[in-house]
């Protein structure tokens, strides 16, 4: 039992939380808090929005984003895409791992109506050392950040 607990303690895990700096408006991935409050990194590293894998294996990766708005913002595409994407060291391109699409504006018929929605993604994927996982939201203007409990991103080895 002691041995089991000890091996569990070294399993890579991370939980990152939304912060005021998460939304860059640059078209890049969301950025995350790594230390304050509920946020932590153990056996994984973080760089420019990405969780960086240092130990190969199967990981449960997850992300939730809180979405909200008043009516339908001008120029909003018909859907909001929330995805977890992988970067490998040889290619500039990202590969889709888990993606969801929402159409919250379909429900916001009144131009002044406040609406809330959320998107959660989670699944087990195999990741090699050196690979990175990032979260992207299109349109990020609709991501609502509060206290680190509404929008988050994490992973743990299974």
């Amino acid at each position: 039992l002691i041995q089991e607990r000890r091996s569990h303690e070294v399993n890579p895990a991370a939980h990152l939380t939304g912060a005021n700096s998460s939304l860059t408006g640059s078209g890049g991935p969301l950025l995350w808090e790594t230390q304050l409050g509920l946020a932590f990194l153990r056996g994984l590293s973080y760089h420019d929005g990405a969780l960086v894998v240092t130990k190969a294996g199967y990981y449960y990766i997850y992300s939730k984003v809180q979405l909200g708005g008043v009516g339908c913002p001008l120029g909003l595409a018909s859907t909001i895409t929330h995805g977890l994407y992988k970067r490998t060291p040889r290619y500039p391109e990202e590969l889709e791992l888990l993606v969801s699409q929402q159409s919250p504006c379909g429900r916001a018929t009144s131009s002044s109506r406040v609406w809330w929605d959320s998107s959660f993604l989670g699944g087990v994927v195999h990741l090699e050392a050196g690979e990175k996982v990032v979260v992207r939201v299109l349109d990020e203007r609709l991501v609502r950040l509060r206290d680190g409990t509404r929008s988050y991103f994490g992973a743990f080895m299974v």
């Epitope: 992988k86 490998t88 060291p89 040889r90 590969l95 195999h126």
Partner: antibody, heavy 112, light 112 residues
Amino acid sequence: QVQLQQSGAELVRPGTSVQVSCKASGYSFTTYLIEWIKQRPGQGLEWIGVINPGTGETKYNENFRAKAIMTADKYSSTAYMQLSSLTADDSAVYFCARWDRWGQGTTLTVSS
Amino acid sequence: DVVMTQAPLSLPVSLGDQVSISCRSSQNLVHSNGNTYFHWYLQKPGQSPELLIYKVSNRFSGVPDRFSGSGSGTDFTLKISRVEAEDLGVYFCSQSTHVPYTFGGGTKLEIK
């Protein structure tokens, strides 16, 4: 464990076509790009192109655009490269590769 | 296309030597996303190439720490601090910042 198993050696006539296969195992096929690379005997490496098996999207070296067609079958976790209008210059070892691992290579000999 | 020029073409060594291989690219390899997609591979006799160093200076899993990579922009270097028998073969540099991806001509590391 991760493996890229390529089809066996081929001896073909000039002017014909051949298909080389690359069967992936030990990982999720659609979450890694697959590259194809040519190596002539005693020579360097020439990049043919890359395919995203999840979407079928491809990028080619223009020097091979009229020569090679890359495809992928998600259901059998296999990438394919078809080479057409073969000449002696196409005789080479062809590798498929993931970013971190390469197949064992397929030797193609074009001879009449 | 980006031309990768390696030097020297052949490198005779004694076991235990420290050696350096250089690679120069004809274009800057810093991608618009800030990363430099420059890598080193080793092809041992009769085998497929294997990844040694990715993105300039990161050792791939299982690669001994006697291998180190450095450089930026257009000039890159692979250093082997103490050559062992298993290090013999042909070393290739490669870039994947610009399509088509390209490889250097290779540097053959051999015993004096």
